[in-house]
């Protein structure tokens, strides 16, 4: 049996339906809903048998629906129960506020019934415009919503909705002006050069997402060049620019893909950093000197080439620091025109290129380095040279065994002849030569020059003194003298002065006749040209007289006698005696006696005769003075 | 009374030549050394040449070497100073002067100027 | 460049004593000898050797030497003293007769 069916409303969108029914096994159950006024088709649903109850929703609010069930069992269908029921009155939402206004965002929060929404259809329009509303669907247990993405300081309408089962409720609508976006502050340029500038700008700390950078040449169609940096960057350097050129760069901040108002500022980037003045000048003949200005740019380095004006092909380059603005370029070829070029290279820019043309010099040289006009304490010098290319000459004058002080001149580059005085006669000396240009010295040349002996007059001896004279000689200088003299005064000046003039080849004199035992100066002087050197001088005593003593008479025998003498050892050659009667009656005898003999026994005289003995002593042919004694023969 | 008396003075061009003769009176000529001795206008003395009694032995100064040659003739109791290639520093007073074995010039005569020039 | 060097002038007052000088190398081995020059005129010799006057020289003048230097002096000089002076040696046989560069003797 199938009975007690009871419909209660559940919701305002549907029905519940209870009833009983024996437990046989039903096969199912038939449903039927018809609104009651039949204005539209039935909905019919089927059931399983084994239920007793069934929810039946998607219905119309406020609607009075009659609902019908049979059951089926065994293919018999059962009566029908039939019922009437109205569904409940749609709920309305509450209230909808804006919570939080923003410059791009709001918060929407609004009362609804619990349960009663599947979701919420929310709609952004904006006031005054035809542009399409921004539609979004929340869902039905939330009452809070944020709305992002809205433009500052804009009026929207912003509409919400309770949606259920095809059903919306009627739309609360609210009314809400965003606010202004946040200002960024001031937009400026700290640094400005030919290629880059460097920007800053002022903002509230943690606003952006990200900034916006345009740069536009001024004036010009080209397209902008942007940048997007990060929103905690507050300064830029904007690179790749070109020099001297005007440029609006402008800046905007981005939060949440919204655009601040740009701030924009115009500058000129500085003009292309130029080389001036290069200047070339010779260092000496195998160089050259540039000099270059430039400002004081960090110049990465200067690049230089050098190359011979006739030569295209051999071209010499360098690199050098951008610290520098002169550089030397040694090496180069003599009297030669070179043409140098130089540019700088600044951040991967290269400078237009300065270029300027200069010759070395020629090549100085010295040679046939001369000595001549050589006296005792001087000498010549003539040498060849470059003409105008010296400002001075080195000479430097070394003795060859080191031990006088090196002497050194300089003299002006036009001379090529210098008197070199003051030196010392008979010495060896090398003479060094070296030219002095701007920034060289040529190499050194060289001659080696002998001063002359002076005219020497030395070593004046005296040799072979005797009793009456002495042998005078002396060196002098083969050539040196016409003539010499030799004066000889006695040293108590109570003699004339003897004077000999000799040849200027003769270096002896051998002089004679002079007195036995007494003191002479001997003065030498040599004449050159009339001219006399101060004399050589010496003293010497000539030897005293040899003498023969004490002749004695002894042993007196009828026939002869025995006679003995001293003398000054060693000094005669040999004796003489001569003896005689004094009465003169016979011939005189004369016996010579070798020197070292003392005594000599006389005999052959006759007896009882008185005899005169006489003895002299020769000396180098010349003889002493002779002693005297008187003898007498004994008896027979 | 010691006489000497230069000639020959006179103006030539460089390169040219001249001839200086010293005539000798006073003194025996072939017993004395003879010499020439010149002065730069406005300069002073400076040694030319020399030559002994007999002509054998002659002494030049190195500015003339080779170029002058001294000579004398002692019969006729004259000097001379032959110059060649003269140049204009050779222009000067031309002094004949002579000496004793054993003095300096002691004797000189009045001078001839010889003028260098173009 | 003499080898031997002089003072180019001296002066001195009339009748004062007055030292001129010579100096060279050559000086240490012969003695100098000194010639007057007046202008236009020839030299004339006043001292030679040790300190010799030809016939005629008036005995105020005198010479010295001493190392590598020569003096002649005039011991009270007078007015015709006035004159340039020329030292002379010999140097040699390369240079047997030199000269100094001459003194000009002034007489105030």
């Known amino acids: 049996e199938l009975e007690n069916l009871t419909v209660t409303e559940v919701g305002w969108d549907g029905l519940r339906l209870n009833w009983t029914a024996a437990d046989q096994a039903y096969e199912h159950f038939i449903i039927q809903v018809q609104e009651a006024n039949k204005v539209e088709a039935a909905r019919n649903l089927t059931v399983p048998g084994s239920l007793r109850a069934v929810d039946i929703p998607g219905l119309k609010a406020a609607t009075p629906y009659t609902v019908s069930i049979y059951g089926v069992i065994q293919g018999y269908r059962t009566p029908v129960l039939s019922a009437e029921a109205s569904t409940g009155e749609t709920p309305n939402l509450g209230e909808v506020v804006v919570a939080e206004v923003g410059w791009d965002a709001l918060k929407l929060n609004w009362t609804a019934p619990e349960g009663a929404y599947e979701y919420f259809f929310i709609q952004v329009q904006e006031a005054d415009t035809v542009e399409a509303a921004q539609n979004l669907t929340v869902p039905g247990g939330l009452r809070s919503t944020d709305l992002p993405g809205l433009k500052a300081a804009t009026h929207y309408t912003i509409t919400i909705r309770g949606v259920t089962q095809d059903f919306s409720t009627t739309p609360l609508s609210v009314e809400v002006l965003t606010e202004e976006v946040p200002d960024m502050g001031n937009l400026t340029v700290t640094e400005v050069s030919w290629d880059a500038l460097r920007l800053n700008w002022t903002t509230p700390d943690g606003t952006y997402d990200q900034f916006t950078i345009q740069v536009q040449e001024a004036d010009q169609v080209e397209e902008a060049h942007n940048l997007t940096v990060p929103g905690s960057l507050r300064s830029m350097e904007i690179p790749g620019l070109r020099a001297g050129t005007p440029y609006t760069v402008t800046l905007h901040g981005e939060v949440r893909g919204h655009s601040t108002r740009p701030l924009a500022v115009e500058v000129v980037t500085e003009d292309l950093p130029q080389l001036g003045d290069l200047a070339v000048s010779e260092v000496g003949w195998d160089g050259l000197r540039l000099n270059w200005t430039a400002a004081d740019n960090a110049y990465e380095h200067f690049v230089i080439q050098v190359q011979e004006v006739n030569k295209v092909e051999a071209a010499q380059n360098l690199t050098l620091p951008g610290s520098l603005r002169a550089v030397d370029i040694p090496g180069l070829e003599a009297a030669t025109p070179y043409r140098v070029s130089i540019y700088g290279v600044i951040r991967g820019y290269r400078t237009p290129v300065l270029s300027a043309e200069a010759s070395t010099a020629k090549e100085p040289e010295i040679g046939n380095l001369n000595v001549s006009d050589i006296t005792p304490e001087s000498f010549n010098l003539s040498w060849m040279a470059t003409d105008g290319i010296f400002e001075t000459f080195t000479i430097e004058i070394i003795d060859s065994n080191r031990l006088l002080e090196t002497v050194e001149y300089n003299i002006s580059g036009a001379e090529r002849t210098a008197h070199i005085s003051g030196l010392p006669p008979s010495t060896d000396f090398i003479v060094y030569l070296s030219g002095l240009a701007p920034s060289i010295r040529t190499k050194t040349i060289s001659a080696t020059a002998t001063t002359e002996a002076l005219p020497l007059l030395e070593n004046l001896t005296i040799s072979d003194i005797n009793p009456y004279g002495f042998t005078v000689s002396w060196m002098a200088s083969e050539n040196a003298f016409d003539s010499f003299l030799v004066t000889v005064v006695d040293s108590g000046k109570l003699l004339d002065p003897q004077e000999f003039t000799l040849s200027g080849t003769q270096r002896k004199l051998e002089l004679r006749g002079l007195i036995t035992g007494i003191g002479y100066e001997v003065m030498v002087s040599g004449f050159t040209q009339g001219h006399q050197t101060k004399p050589l001088r010496a003293e010497i005593v000539t030897e005293a007289e040899p003498e023969v003593d004490n002749l004695l008479v002894s042993d007196a025998t009828p026939d002869g006698f025995r006679l003995s003498w001293t003398a000054d050892e060693g000094v005669f050659d040999n004796f003489v005696l001569k003896i005689r009667d004094t009465k003169k009656q016979s011939e005189p005898l004369e016996i010579t006696l070798l020197a070292p003999e003392r005594t000599r026994d006389i005999t052959g005289l006759r007896e009882a005769t008185e005899y005169e003995i006489e003895l002299y002593g020769i000396s180098k042919g010349r003889r002493s003075q002779t002693v005297s004694a008187i003898a007498t023969t004994a008896m027979g | 009374e010691v006489q000497l008396v230069e000639s020959g003075g006179g103006l030539v061009q460089p390169g040219g030549s001249l001839r200086l003769s010293c005539a000798a009176s006073?003194?025996?000529?072939?017993?004395?050394?003879m010499g020439w001795v010149r002065q730069a206008p406005g300069k002073g003395l400076e040694w030319v040449s020399a030559?002994?009694?007999?002509?054998?032995?002659?002494y030049y100064a190195d500015s003339v070497k080779g170029r002058f040659t001294i000579s004398r003739d002692n019969s006729k109791n004259t000097l001379y100073l032959q110059m060649n290639s003269l140049r204009a520093e050779d222009t000067a007073v031309y002094y004949c002067?002579?000496?004793?074995?054993?003095?300096?010039?002691?004797?000189w005569g009045q001078g001839t100027l010889v003028t260098v020039s173009r | 460049s003499s080898e031997l060097t002089q003072d180019p002038a001296v002066s001195v007052a009339l009748g004062q004593t007055v030292r001129i000088t010579c100096q060279g190398d050559?000086?240490?081995?012969?003695?100098a000898s000194w010639y007057q020059q007046k202008p236009g005129q020839a030299p004339v010799l006043v001292i030679y050797?040790?300190?010799n006057r030809p016939s005629g020289i008036p005995d105020r003048f005198s010479g010295s030497s001493s190392g590598n230097t020569a003096s002649l002096t005039i011991t009270g000089a007078q007015a015709e003293d006035e004159a340039d002076y020329y030292c002379?040696?010999?140097?040699?046989?390369?240079?047997?007769?030199?000269f100094g560069g001459g003194t000009k003797l002034t007489v105030l």
């Open positions: 002067a002579k000496h004793p074995p054993h003095r300096p010039f002691d004797y």
């Open positions: 006073g003194f025996t000529f072939s017993g004395s050394r």
């Open positions: 030559i002994n009694e007999e002509g054998g032995q002659t």
């Open positions: 050559s000086l240490r081995s012969y003695y």
């Open positions: 050797g040790k300190n």
């Open positions: 002379n040696s010999s140097h040699g046989p390369r240079r047997p007769v030199v």
